[in-house]
Amino acid sequence: QAAPFPELCSYTWEAVDTKNNVLYKINICGSVDIVQCGPSSAVCMHDLKTRTYHSVGDSVLRSATRSLLEFNTTVSCDQQGTNHRVQSSIAFLCGKTLGTPEFVTATECVHYFEWRTTAACKKDIFKANKEVPCYVFDEELRKHDLNPLIKLSGAYLVDDSDPDTSLFINVCRDIDTLRDPGSQLRACPPGTAACLVRGHQAFDVGQPRDGLKVVRKDRLVLSYVREEAGKLDFCDGHSPAVTITFVCPSERREGTIPKLTAKSNCRYEIEWITEYACHRDYLESKTCSLSGEQQDVSIDLTPLAQSGGSSYISDGKEYLFYLNVCGETEIQFCNKKQAAVCQVKKSDTSQVKAAGRYHNQTLRYSDGDLTLIYFGGDECSSGFQRMSVINFECNKTAGNDGKGTPVFTGEVDCTYEFTWDTEYACVHHHHHH
């Protein structure tokens, strides 16, 4: 039986049940290399409380559809009077990066995971030439996730004192020059994640090979190497390589750009101070507020919720967008879709799409940017579920009693972007990270 998602096959992936202190190792095409789980375990559960291992999915007992992967075991579970066996179930949804498997819940018999990934899309528009896992769990099982830094087109320019060269990088995947052929990047070879531009020439100085690694609690490392043999004539016989160290800052700050800290014989060392290197709970909340010791800030967008069936309206040329954030009030136009953002075609108001659901909400404050994300909307033709990204700006003189109003700024591949100036986005900082 062919592997259902070949792009995901090269790695053993991790997911965590934080509530119960359990680390799962997942290999969807073969078996995880953990002796205690046996030779054919595809999903191995490491219980850190009891220091025990249990296989909860066998690679031999795999069944697959386009969007669901199930691994059974021969271990019976406790449901009285039944013949159930312990199993793992992974639901796949289309995403714009390789993504990460997320633990959802576990019953007596079934361990459930969800995975938003390019591998599950109906079309190949989001697929990279080369991409590696872009998240890691630290020793306290806290997740550090750099997926939001991955550029689907274009690249980051590294801060470098050399006026004759420009070093461009992407995070965890190669630079896509076709989708956004900026003049300097157009010459970058396919597959490169680190592209050195000198004049009109561009050179591959590194491709992603291994996933993100954690070296200390707040330092993550990504290494790129040039795969093919042909040495570059300006590298003194050495093979090029790039090491990017992502550093979680000691306190809240604005974002910085990646900086070149050392360069020798085409070995480039880059340091990037970014809050995306911090653990995810420091940056994100599933509610509309971020506060407390853990986050070092106080943010509360809940006053932006509209009651009584009214919504914010944002004009998007062909479409009108109805928004109701930070609540669970149905948008009247949106036909009980549980939408937080609803897209209605002006020329045909029966064409209504959920552009993100209120149950699928993430508030993120990272590198000085405050963003509210709604995902899990109606599918586009690629299989990607529509999502909305609302970028907030602090404005103490915003109209509408300080609430302000969202402004639609554009759509890329079924992701709808809005900006919203409001006094409720003014962040209060604490200083004790």
Partner: nanobody
Framework: DVQLVESGGGLVQPGGSLRLSCAAS????????MDWYRQAPGKQREWVAT???????TYADSVKGRFTISRDNAKNTVYLQMNSLRPEDTAVYYC??????????WGQGTLVTVSS
């Protein structure tokens, strides 16, 4: 005050059964993962069974098929049903509660003796 109180231990013949109870107070019981451990005389404490907050269960190989862990959230109680008991199951049995927001909480233990 947060505490766990075990009960149900006692003397039983080989092949017999016992049901241990662990009553919790002062915690949101359903949010906690519950574990049973045991400590035989002169030996290290060893893990016996786990019932996670979501409901999944795991057992040490030595008790698999003989012991069953369960919970009653309404009564804030976790149980360990022990069947086909063997002399080597003789030990003090402890329950433990843990959650991401609390330090691990242990009960005081209940003695199980399997002997003819």
């Amino acid at each position: 005050d947060v505490q766990l109180v075990e009960s149900g231990g006692g003397l039983v013949q080989p092949g017999g059964s016992l049901r241990l109870s662990c009553a919790a107070s002062g915690i949101i019981f359903s949010d906690n993962r519950m574990d049973w451990y045991r400590q035989a005389p002169g030996k290290q404490r060893e893990w016996v069974a786990t019932l996670a907050s979501y409901g999944w269960k795991t057992y040490a190989d030595s008790v698999k098929g003989r012991f069953t862990i369960s919970r009653d959230n309404a009564k804030n109680t976790v149980y360990l049903q022990m069947n086909s008991l063997r002399p080597e199951d003789t030990a003090v049995y402890y329950c433990k509660a843990s959650s991401p927001v609390l330090n691990d909480i242990w009960g005081q233990g209940t003695l199980v003796t399997v002997s003819s």
